[in-house]
């Protein structure tokens, strides 16, 4: 079932082959350079989303610069298909499942002084599921309540203040988020959960709910990078990817992902026993992408040099701001008991095959489906 | 079987130091952490500290930093409390119970280590 | 650190009535622990993580609460149940333990 979901992986949720960038993976090194000691938490396939739907709007060297940024290079017939695939996948992501809970969207918050073309919001309505909505951005406070109430109305609440302050100037901004909980196909014991020490660095523990489960894992030690992979699935078809580094080697790790680092770990998984303790944590990213994709070559539109003649027939228009946010909950929930009483484990003795993994320091996770749903570094749970 | 087996009792006099020690059975302490609490007569508990023998990281109350050094032979599976500059403050019974992953943390005691500072 | 107060410092009950032992912390807690203790013996696990009894603890324990605030309740007191009671946190070091709640039997 692991090797179907290799084959199936569309990294980075780009539906198209030819790519000259890892777009998920230049993302999130850029993120990490910009805040080396911070948590990290993003979607790939939501951002690639918005920034394909943003695509539809674009032209010349703007559309191309998106498109290139994500590692896609298209052919006239192939970016259709790629709005296609897009749409598809949404339809897939936003179907009600039992016990997963997924809230993904987009939106676009324009100027009262914006005509947008109807082309594009019909476009952006029928491939991207997306709203547009008329903002008055001089009263700024007020401009900042709508798109939040919005956010958090949209995820039931999940996210909340998605903004934290807002330029009046603003013409356009961009919306994108998305919120994950879903539950692990056989649950962790709450009564196995106990607070633990995790090192923030070598100095530096804090303690944290540590749930643990024995059981049988998708595993694997990888030496070239020097660190130990776990494959954790949920109900359905997502799993949950948790890297730990071995000490010391966090940087080496995070140099080292690809999509050809991922589709080999996917690929080498094998079944192995292991008393697994992971911290119950929730984790949330919150990222203003116009700062962060210039150095991934996509900055024509968030400049004077844009072009998004696509959108709106006024000549100056750009993206303001591109705002993202992802939060994931990680806790013991279930759709099966685990096998596990009162107590945490039997003795060792009886369980001498049995490897123990502690995600007690720094860690990475990816949650995968047939894309990268989210890819994160938990620095502090 | 899980058990810990602590030293007999200790008669000091004060400036003097001494160490005691927890023997545990039934399992390895190398896979483990050990805590050790303080209680003076007729008083509460008070949590001394803890050594995690995976990585040797200790971490103690700062009012027993420098009065107590938590410590351990793994080979013979035992855990070693030593309390230094004694006063007649420290006269109480010291206990070590049992921490770590695979287990409750203070789900196992030691019987106790009765010392008296006494000139 | 985090210092826990425990209320009442003493108290007796009747065989039978319910007793409520309750702790505050200074700071919120992931989660709190409790303990018992008699005379010449030492402290035994009681209640872990909260809400949990651990092994062979009776039924008519029980734990609650969150963040600053939780209790041990004895839902019918009986002889047995005479001993002292300490609360414990582990949520952030030092580790620190209430002062104790020595209930007797009326």
């Known amino acids: 079932e692991m090797k179907k979901r290799v084959e199936d992986l569309h990294v980075g949720a780009t539906v198209a082959p030819s790519s000259r960038r890892d777009f998920t993976f230049d993302l999130y090194r850029a993120l990490a350079s910009a805040a080396p000691s911070q948590s990290i938490f993003f979607s790939p396939v939501s951002i690639s989303m918005s920034l394909a739907m943003l695509s539809l709007g674009a032209g010349s060297s703007t559309k191309m610069q998106i498109l290139e940024g994500l590692g896609l290079n298209l052919q006239k017939s192939s970016e259709k298909e790629l709005h296609r695939g897009f749409q598809q996948l949404l339809q897939e992501l936003n179907q009600p499942r039992d016990g997963f809970q997924l809230s993904l969207g987009n939106a676009l918050f324009t100027d009262l002084v914006v005509d947008l073309q109807d082309t594009f919001v019909s476009a952006m309505k029928t491939l991207y599921l997306a709203d547009t909505f008329p903002t008055n951005f001089r009263d700024s406070a007020g401009a900042m309540k709508q798109i939040n109430d919005y956010v958090a109305k949209q995820t039931k609440g999940k996210i909340v203040d998605l903004l934290k302050n807002l330029d009046s100037n603003a013409v356009v901004i961009m919306v994108n988020y998305i919120f994950f909980k879903a539950k692990w196909e056989t649950s962790f014991n709450h009564k196995g959960t106990q607070e633990q020490d995790f090192y923030v660095t070598s100095e530096t523990v804090v303690r944290v709910p540590m749930m643990s489960r024995e059981d049988q894992y998708h595993y694997l030690l990888d030496r070239n990078l020097s660190c130990r992979v776990v494959g954790v699935p949920y109900q359905g078809n997502a799993t949950a990817l948790f890297i730990l580094p071995s000490e010391g080697k966090m940087q080496q790790v995070e140099n080292g992902l690809s999509e050809k680092t991922l589709r080999k770990w996917l690929k080498m998984f094998k079944k192995r026993q292991l008393e697994l303790y992971l911290p119950k944590f929730s984790i949330e990213g919150s990222y203003q992408l116009e700062k962060v994709l210039p150095s991934l070559g996509i900055s024509n539109v968030f400049t004077s040099h844009a072009d998004l003649s696509g959108i709106s027939n006024h000549s100056n228009i750009q993206v303001s701001e591109m705002v993202h946010k992802a939060v994931v909950e990680v806790d013991e929930s279930g759709t099966r008991a685990a096998a596990a009483t009162g107590t945490i484990f039997t003795f060792r003795s009886a369980r001498l095959n049995s490897q123990r993994l502690v995600f007690n320091r720094p860690f990475l996770m990816f949650i995968v489906d047939n894309n990268i749903l989210f890819l994160g570094k938990v620095n502090r749970p | 079987e899980v058990q810990l087996q602590q030293s007999g009792a200790e008669l000091v006099k004060p400036g003097a130091s001494v160490k005691l020690s927890c023997t545990a059975s039934g399992f390895d302490i190398k896979d483990t952490f050990m805590h050790w609490v303080k209680q003076r007569p007729e008083q509460g508990l008070e949590w001394i500290g803890r050594?995690?023998?995976?990585?040797?990281?200790?971490k103690y109350d700062p009012k027993f930093q420098g009065k107590a050094t938590i410590t351990g032979d793994t080979s013979s599976n035992t855990a070693y409390l030593q309390l230094s500059s004694l006063t007649s403050e420290d006269t109480a019974v010291y206990y070590c119970a049992r921490g770590g992953y695979d287990v409750r943390e203070f789900a196992y005691w030691g019987q106790g280590t009765l010392v008296t500072v006494s000139a | 650190q985090i210092v826990l107060t425990q209320s009442p410092a003493i108290m007796s009950a009747s065989p039978g009535e319910k007793v409520t032992i309750t702790c505050s912390a200074t700071?919120?807690?992931?989660?709190m622990h409790w303990f018992q203790q008699k005379p010449g013996s030492s402290p035994e696990l009681w209640i872990y993580s909260t809400s949990n009894l651990a092994s062979g603890v009776p039924a008519r324990f029980s734990g609650s609460g969150s963040g600053t605030s939780y209790s041990l309740t004895i839902s019918r007191m009986e002889a047995e149940d005479a001993a002292t009671y300490y609360c414990q946190q582990r949520s952030s070091y030092p580790f620190t333990f209430g002062s104790g709640t020595k209930l007797e039997i009326k």
């Open positions: 700071s919120s807690l992931i989660y």
């Open positions: 050594i995690d023998y995976v990585n040797g990281n200790t």
